[in-house]
Interface confidence: low
């Protein structure tokens, strides 16, 4: 399904766009990426509020959302094999665009411990409640979806695009319409801030009443960290309105001349900028020249300034920006060192956790520990990892290799294991014989027994469960397979169909099987393939049978 941009909010140095469309997290990230962004980060309460605003915009325009609870992908994910870390705010998840573990989080509920498959985070919105700005969307983690199957209740996603800076919206001094086209291919006529490299088309006039005039501007970087349109004076001015329309497009004061013309002015302590519209403080610190956490300190008489850095930082060559000292260069950690603003943090590789002697030491995580094992059966802890194993008669299964699935020995790739009837059971199988034949001591072959027109041998009844498996002692059993707890057949009879000769005697067994041809004392090697007897379990009338259990290595005995 495609995704439509329905809403955009630009604030600070970033724009957030909200899209509706049922996509997997990977498809959503790809959509953001195509326009130069990523799935949105929500690294602080303020950012959560920006994201909420863009979702509120989307939801007011989106009539199609009928679900009560709705989810929107954000850029928080945990790769397969990376385990949950309850001690961290992000619980071991990380932001798609990179960046350190951030302190803000807003999880919907306690997270389940799982390292097996990739997990993705969406914002959970209760659409039956008004989106009060104080109620920030909760984080919900789950499977990341796949093309065509995006995940439960996924209604869309939020992208984030970061910029060097923003221009102020263009101010109109008379009737007209501004249309902004952003670098991420969104058009809007009302943005609180307009990202660098956006284009603005201004159509002046009141539609049919006047001839419309058009202007085109580009948001450019005029000087380091100073962004403007390169326009001069208010746009779409009209003597008819003077200062009465939108304050003449002026930022602060508007002064009218007697002929309907007007000029913009500024209040005491402010000066008019080159665009002849905007006012800026005469205080050199008011334009926030210092970056990266640096504090602007006014010089004597308020004429100049210097930037001062907080502890753990130093000014860079521009003398405007604070840069962090990289403590990780001294290798203080046993495994991974993450440089953080003003400090550092030690981390452990996947499969390890903090612990052991010394600062920043790591120790192996025992994934197989009691109550923690992700494996269905056997679990072996290894240094930094683990692997699952299955009991005999089962093989590893599931996309993550943690589940165990019964091997159907009766249809195995190595060909038939039984010479006549084969009954698959959970973790094992039984051989059986057709009426008139008994199971040989090897538990696989059939030998001619007393002539009988009874049913074929089958698996033991439930009452016989106590008898040791592996025995070749004949016992009374029906060919109807016993049933498991959910009512599913526990054993399905499978037969090797022998090749037929003209003198082959025909049995009257309910399974409609043909007796073997060849020497009466020996069961002949089957010449065709395994096929499940009839279309399902039959209900024979009873009779003698001979059954043995086999391990999948062909030897007698129990697992």
């Amino acid at each position: 399904t495609g995704a439509d941009t329905e809403a955009v909010v630009c604030v600070g140095t970033a724009c957030y766009t909200a899209h509706s469309g049922k996509l997997s997290a990977a498809e959503a990230q790809n959509h953001c990426n195509q326009n130069g962004g990523n799935l949105a980060t929500v690294k602080s309460k303020e950012e959560a509020q920006h994201v909420q605003r863009v979702l509120a915009q989307l939801l007011r325009r989106e009539a199609a959302l009928t679900a009560r609870m709705s989810k929107f992908w954000i850029g928080l994910q945990r790769e397969k094999g990376k385990c949950l870390d309850p001690s961290l705010p992000l619980k071991g998840f990380s932001w798609v665009g990179g960046g350190e573990d951030t302190p803000y989080s807003n999880w919907h509920k306690e997270l389940r411990n799982s390292c097996i498959s990739k997990r993705c985070v969406s914002l959970l919105l209760d659409l039956s409640q008004p989106l009060l700005p104080s109620r920030l969307p909760k984080w919900s983690e789950g499977p990341c979806g796949s093309p065509g199957s995006p995940g439960s209740n996924i209604e869309g996603f939020v992208c984030k695009f970061s910029f060097k800076g923003m221009c102020r919206p263009l101010a109109l001094g008379g009737p007209g319409q501004v249309t902004y086209t952003t670098p991420f291919q969104t058009t809007s006529s009302s943005l609180e801030a307009v990202p660098f490299a956006s284009a603005a088309n201004v159509a002046c006039g009141e539609g049919d009443k006047d001839e419309t005039q058009s202007h085109y501007f580009l948001c450019k970087e005029k000087a380091p960290d100073v962004f403007d349109w390169g326009s001069s004076g208010p746009l779409c001015v009209s003597p008819k309105y003077g200062c009465n329309f939108n304050n003449g497009g002026c930022h602060q004061d508007c002064f009218e001349g007697g002929d309907g013309s007007f000029l913009c002015g500024c209040r005491p302590g402010f000066r008019l900028l080159d665009d002849l519209v905007t006012c800026a403080s005469r205080n050199p610190c008011s334009s926030s020249p210092c970056r990266g956490g640096a504090t602007c300190v006014l010089g004597p008489h308020g004429k100049n300034y210097t930037c001062r850095c907080p502890q753990g930082y130093q000014l860079d060559s521009s003398q405007l920006d604070c840069v962090d000292v990289d403590e990780c260069q001294d290798s203080p950690c046993a495994q991974e060192c993450v440089n953080t603003p003003g400090g550092f943090r030690c981390e452990c590789w996947v499969g390890y956790e903090p612990g052991g002697p010394g600062e920043g030491a790591c120790q192996d995580v025992d994934e197989c520990a009691l109550g923690r094992s992700p494996c269905a059966q056997g679990c072996t802890n290894t240094d930094g990892s683990f692997h699952c194993s299955c009991e005999e008669g089962y093989v590893l299964a599931g996309e993550d290799g943690t589940q165990c699935q019964d091997v159907d020995e009766c249809v195995g790739p190595g060909g038939p294991l039984c010479d006549s009837l084969c009954f698959n059971t959970q973790g094992s199988f039984h051989c059986g014989c057709l009426p008139g034949w008994v199971l040989a001591p090897n538990g696989v072959s059939c030998t001619m027994g007393p002539v009988s027109l009874g049913p074929p041998s089958g698996p033991p009844d439930e009452e016989d469960k106590g008898e040791k498996e592996g025995s070749t002692v004949p016992r009374a059993a029906t060919a109807s397979p016993t049933r498991g707890p959910e009512g599913t057949p526990k054993a399905t009879p499978t037969t090797s169909r022998p090749s037929l000769s003209s003198d082959a005697p025909i049995t009257s067994a309910p399974l409609k099987m043909l007796a073997p041809s060849g020497s009466p004392g020996v069961w002949r090697e089957p010449s065709i393939h395994h096929a499940t007897a009839a279309s399902g379990p039959q209900e024979p009338a009873g009779g003698d049978s001979s059954v043995a259990t086999q391990n999948n290595d062909g030897t007698d005995g129990q697992k």
Partner: antibody, heavy 120, light 111 residues
Amino acid sequence: QVQLVESGAEVKKPGASVKLSCKASGYTFTSYWMHWVRQAPGQRLEWMGEIDPSASYTYYNQKFKGRVTITVDKSASTAYMELSSLRSEDTAVYYCARSVYYGNKYFDVWGPGTTVTVSS
Amino acid sequence: DIQMTQSPSSLSASVGDRVTITCRASQSVDYAGDSYMNWYQQKPGKAPKLLIYAASNLESGVPSRFSGSGSGTDFTLTISSLEDEDFATYYCQQTNEDPRTFGGGTKLEIK
């Protein structure tokens, strides 16, 4: 400086409608929510509703739903509140007030208030 | 709706006195670690004026003798040393849930 200026006092008959205006100046009109609050004589303050001037989104107090309509004219930096089907208990001072955009939407700037009298 | 109950409804005090006004919400007005409780002062014939927001933050320009505290459902406005211009009516307000609601007011009079 930041200020909100409301329209003049109104006297209306029961069943009529009244439309009050609130002109904002000294700040970016579209960067704050605009609210309407009323106060009947001797009564507590009562929040009526709010509007986001940048996109004209509105939330209303359910008590007034269907009777109150809040609108804005961005070009004139003015918010309007219309109350219909007036009754005598709507006699009150009506204030416009702005609030921050996010989180705790406290009202940091108020207009001086407009008196509306509903009387037959 | 969240009901806001202020006490006392009126109070007589003298200049220099320490005064405490309480406000109780019918349910918690806390969210994500913040209290969505605000206090206003109103003088006769004037619009209310913001004093305290988010339970304990002093609005710019408000004298430091005003302070707010509390969380959950119980909140307090304290004036450490009354001055002449403090005689007015005080209202609490919650902004955690729609509709935003106000307390009934506490009228502070000169003794």
